[in-house]
Amino acid sequence: RQQWELQGDRRCQSQLERANLRPCEQHLMQKIQRDEDSYGRDPYSPSQDPYSPSQDPDRRDPYSPSPYDRRGAGSSQHQERCCNELNEFENNQRCMCEALQQIMENQSDRLQGRQQEQQFKRELRNLPQQCGLRAPQRCDLEVESGGRDRY
C-alpha cells in the first residue's frame, strides 16, 4: 500500500509540474477584481473596462487575455482553459486538492484583505464544480503567512 501511495504521490507531482494553472489564477483574480471594482467604484465615474488586466498588445504574456476582451470575456476564456487543466486531476481527489492549494499559494500574497482572501478561497473551492468536476471533500486552503512570491 505504501508503494502504491508513493507512486501516487510521484504521479501527482509530475501532473502538477506539467499542469499550467495560470488560467485558473487569472480567472479567479479577474473575478475578485471585478467585484472590487463594482463595489468600490463611483457608479457615476465612467472608467476604462476594469474587467480585463492591462496589456500592451505588443508585449503580451502568452497566458494573458487580449487587451480587447470586454466585460469578462477574457475571464470565461480563462475558465475554459482552467477547466481543461483541472480535468487532468479528475481521477485523483488528493491531487486535485494539491492543485487548488498551489493556486492559493501562488496568489496569497496578492490578497491583502480578509474579504479578498475569503472570496478567493470560496471561488477556488467552487472551481472544480464550475468545471463539472468532483470537488475534493476535504481540502485545506490555509497558507502560511505571506504565501509564496510567484511573479
Partner: antibody, heavy 118, light 111 residues
C-alpha cells in the same frame, strides 16, 4: 467616510525612540493590510512598512529593518510604528495608509512630522 | 529591489493641452495572474497623496476620465487628455509586485 489620523510625531534626538499611532475609522479596520509611508521634507514618497490584516505578515523597507516595528490593535482600530535608534535621515512626514485588499494604497492620512535632530 | 524611474521629472503644462508621464521599472511588473502591479498617485500642493490609477489602467473612484493609464511589463504611461489647473502637483508611479516602491515623482506645473 474613511479617516486616518496620525499622532506621536515630534522632535527627537538621534539614537532615541518614538512611537507613532494611527486611529482609523469609516471602514472595517481588521479587514485590511495597513502601511506606513514617509516623505522627507521636499522629497518623494518612500514606503516604510506594512502589516497584514491579521498581523500574519510584516514587511519593512531595508532602510528601517531592525530599527522599526509595525503593529496593530484591531480592537482599538489602531496602527502603530515603533521607531528605535532614530537617525537624521528618518526625518519625514509619516503617513498612515490603507490598502484596498489588492496591494493598492487607496486612502492616506494627513501625516505626522518626525524630526530627528540634536 | 525593484527600481522605478519616472520621466520627465518636471513637466510644464498648458491648460487644455494633453500631458504624458512615463514610468519604467527595473523588472517586469506583470504578475502570473495577468495583472500589472503598477499604480499612479497625485500629490497636490500641501495635500496627502491620492490614488489615481490602480493595476496600470483602472481609474480610481471619482477620478476624472481625462486621466488614463496604460502599459505592461516594464513601461507605463499616465496620460491627461486635457490638463486643468487643478491637476498641478507631483505624480508618482508605484510598483506593488514585490513589497512597494515609488518613482521619484514628476512635478506638473502650469506654464
Amino acid at each position: 467616510e474613511v479617516q486616518l489620523v496620525e499622532s506621536g510625531g515630534g522632535l527627537v534626538q538621534p539614537g532615541r525612540s518614538l512611537r507613532l499611532s494611527c486611529a482609523a475609522s469609516g471602514f472595517t479596520f481588521d479587514d485590511y493590510t495597513m502601511h506606513w509611508v514617509r516623505q522627507a521634507p521636499g522629497k518623494g514618497l518612500e514606503w516604510v512598512s506594512s502589516i497584514r490584516w491579521n498581523s500574519g505578515n510584516l514587511d519593512y523597507a531595508d532602510s528601517v529593518k531592525g530599527r522599526f516595528t509595525i503593529s496593530r490593535d484591531n480592537a482599538r482600530h489602531s496602527l502603530y510604528l515603533q521607531m528605535n535608534s532614530l537617525r537624521a535621515e528618518d526625518t519625514a512626514l509619516y503617513y498612515c495608509v490603507k490598502d484596498n485588499g489588492l496591494r493598492t494604497l487607496d486612502f492616506w492620512g494627513q501625516g505626522t512630522l518626525v524630526t530627528v535632530s540634536s | 529591489d525593484i527600481v522605478m524611474t519616472q520621466s520627465p521629472l518636471s513637466l510644464p503644462v498648458t491648460p487644455g493641452e494633453p500631458a504624458s508621464i512615463s514610468c519604467r521599472s527595473s523588472q517586469s511588473l506583470l504578475h502570473r495572474n495577468g495583472y500589472n502591479y503598477l499604480d499612479w498617485y497625485l500629490q497636490k500642493p500641501g495635500q496627502s497623496p491620492q490614488l489615481l490609477i490602480s493595476l496600470a489602467s483602472n481609474r480610481a473612484s471619482g477620478v476624472p476620465d481625462r486621466f488614463s493609464g496604460s502599459g505592461s511589463g516594464t513601461d507605463f504611461t499616465l496620460k491627461i487628455s486635457r490638463v486643468e489647473a487643478e491637476d498641478v502637483g507631483v505624480y508618482y508611479c508605484m510598483q506593488a509586485l514585490q513589497t512597494w516602491t515609488f518613482g521619484q515623482g514628476t512635478k506638473v506645473e502650469l506654464k
